[in-house]
């Protein structure tokens, strides 16, 4: 008898993060035998979708011609061929930006900053949050993940960096999440510069442990004072 | 494209009370504050308040507290403001307006009640 | 609650002339948090919608032309168009977002001479 039938292989285009009300196309690709295909979401009935195949009959085409919040979420294919169903493809992470307001982000002291010092980027979201995702500009993967410990909502998050390098330098963008779905993101921040200046021998970038992100002080503009202070987002690095 | 669509002209009757709706589309409606500002005629911006359409929560102006209140329809995407107990005074041009980061980003066209025996 | 004040209440300019219009607070708009000023700015044509033209007092909103350019810090802030053109002709707000309630100032009406 032979083994299972070979894994099929899941993709969106244009990319798995989708803003609001923008096109996507899902393709399943497995092989020349399938007479079926089906797409499944997590946490929603089986299949999600069927489709049959386009020729040569190796893939099939799930269309989203407007993404919204329903759409976001974990899928997996699958195609049938006469000995029955393949083994379910690796997992998609299909990410809907634009599900809340952009939050601000900023650096502290300055986005001006001398190797070897220390900055803070302070991502601040218009309503409590307790995910924070930072991002740098052709990064392959978010640079940092902070995740509130308890599911204490928070109305920023604080991102140290210490001791800084020429590696810092570029451009940074933050998402804020609610942790009922990590699938749908906020609007991303306006990009924020962060400049290197400085001559020193820059040693190896290390990010520092210090996960403050208690709101402010009083003054903190619109911003509540009653949340626990330094209930904690817990850092994971990506 | 967001468009914030409001509901047309009200002439009502001093004492009465009044609702006009904002219908939002083209964004993710749940996940943005909506606010209301009133114009009187010749006259500059007061802030009425707001609500987040994902959980119904609301604040106000403790000038509107009692005159204004804020309600959602999140099955039509659509925020309400009833006012109530209407004087002359109530006579304005009263916009809805999403809220980016406290400060608004899109304004409805306007709904203007005059207030009138 | 904050009291924001604009001046001039109106200014008459011709086309092509820089324009520099002031927004003054009761107290600072400026953040110790993120070092950011809590302000932004409309733009009002007769009969329409205010619109946003800048908001942490001197960011420009998404396809508002580079002649406007906000600036200023804590309690004074200033709105300057460096070529008016015809289709500017209108009121500006001033707007504060730094405590509840937002407040507006009483605006600055731009005319042609």
């Known amino acids: 008898q032979a083994g299972p039938l070979p894994k099929p292989t899941l993709w969106a285009e244009p990319g798995s993060v989708i803003s609001w009300g923008n096109s996507v196309t899902i393709w399943c690709q497995g092989t020349l035998e399938a007479r079926e295909y089906r797409l499944d979401k997590e946490e929603s009935p089986a299949p999600w979708d069927r489709q049959n195949p386009l020729e040569p009959k190796n893939k099939a085409r799930f269309s989203i011609p407007s993404m919204t919040e329903d759409y976001a979420g974990r899928y997996r294919c699958y195609y049938r061929s006469p000995v029955g169903w393949s083994q379910p493809s690796d997992p998609l992470e299909l990410v809907m930006t634009g599900a809340y307001s952009k939050p601000t982000l900023s650096a502290l002291p300055s986005p001006l900053v001398t190797s070897g010092k220390s900055v803070t980027l302070l991502c601040q979201s218009r309503s409590p949050m307790d995910t924070f995702l930072l991002i740098k500009e052709r990064a392959a993967h978010p640079l940092l993940h902070l995740r509130s410990e308890h599911g204490a909502q928070q109305h920023q998050a604080e991102f140290p960096m210490s001791p800084v390098t020429s590696v810092h330098g570029g451009t940074y963008r933050c998402f804020s999440s609610h942790g009922f779905s990590h699938y749908l993101l906020s609007h991303p921040s306006d990009p924020l510069e962060l400049i290197v200046s400085g001559s020193l021998e820059d040693p190896r970038p290390s990010p520092t442990r210090s996960v403050s992100t208690a709101a402010g002080p009083e003054d903190q503009p619109l911003m509540p004072t009653g949340s626990v202070p330094h209930s904690g987002l817990r850092r994971h690095w990506e | 494209e967001v468009q914030l669509q409001q509901s047309g002209p009200e002439l009502v009757k001093p004492g009465a009370s009044v609702k006009i709706s904002c219908k939002a589309s083209g964004y993710s409606f749940t996940g943005f504050y909506i606010d209301w500002v009133k114009q009187s005629p010749g006259k500059s911006l007061e802030w009425i308040g707001y609500?987040?359409?994902?959980?119904?929560?609301?604040s106000y102006n403790q000038k509107f507290k009692g005159k204004a209140t804020l309600t959602v329809d999140k099955s039509s995407s659509t925020v309400n403001m009833q006012l109530n107990s209407l004087t002359s005074e109530d006579s304005a041009v009263y916009y809805c307006?999403?809220?980016?980061?406290?400060?608004?980003?899109?304004w409805g066209q306007g709904t203007t009640l005059t207030v009138s025996s | 609650d904050i009291v924001m004040s604009q001046s001039p209440s109106s200014l008459a300019v011709s086309v092509g002339e820089k324009v520099t219009m002031s927004c003054k607070s009761s107290?600072?708009?400026?953040?110790?948090?993120?070092?950011?000023?809590?302000l932004a700015w409309y733009q009002q044509k007769p009969g329409q919608s205010p619109k946003l033209l800048i908001y942490w007092a001197s960011t420009r909103e998404s396809g508002v032309p580079d002649r406007f350019a906000g600036s200023g810090s804590g309690t004074d802030f200033t709105l300057t168009i460096s070529s008016v053109k015809a289709e500017d002709l209108a009121v500006y707000y001033c707007?504060?977002?730094?405590?509840?309630?937002?407040?507006f100032g009483a605006g600055t009406k731009l005319e042609l001479k």
């Open positions: 107290q600072s708009l400026l953040s110790s948090s993120n070092q950011k000023n809590y």
């Open positions: 707007q504060q977002y730094y405590s509840y309630p937002l407040t």
């Open positions: 307006a999403r809220q980016a980061f406290y400060y608004f980003d899109y």
């Open positions: 609500i987040f359409p994902s959980n119904g929560e609301t």
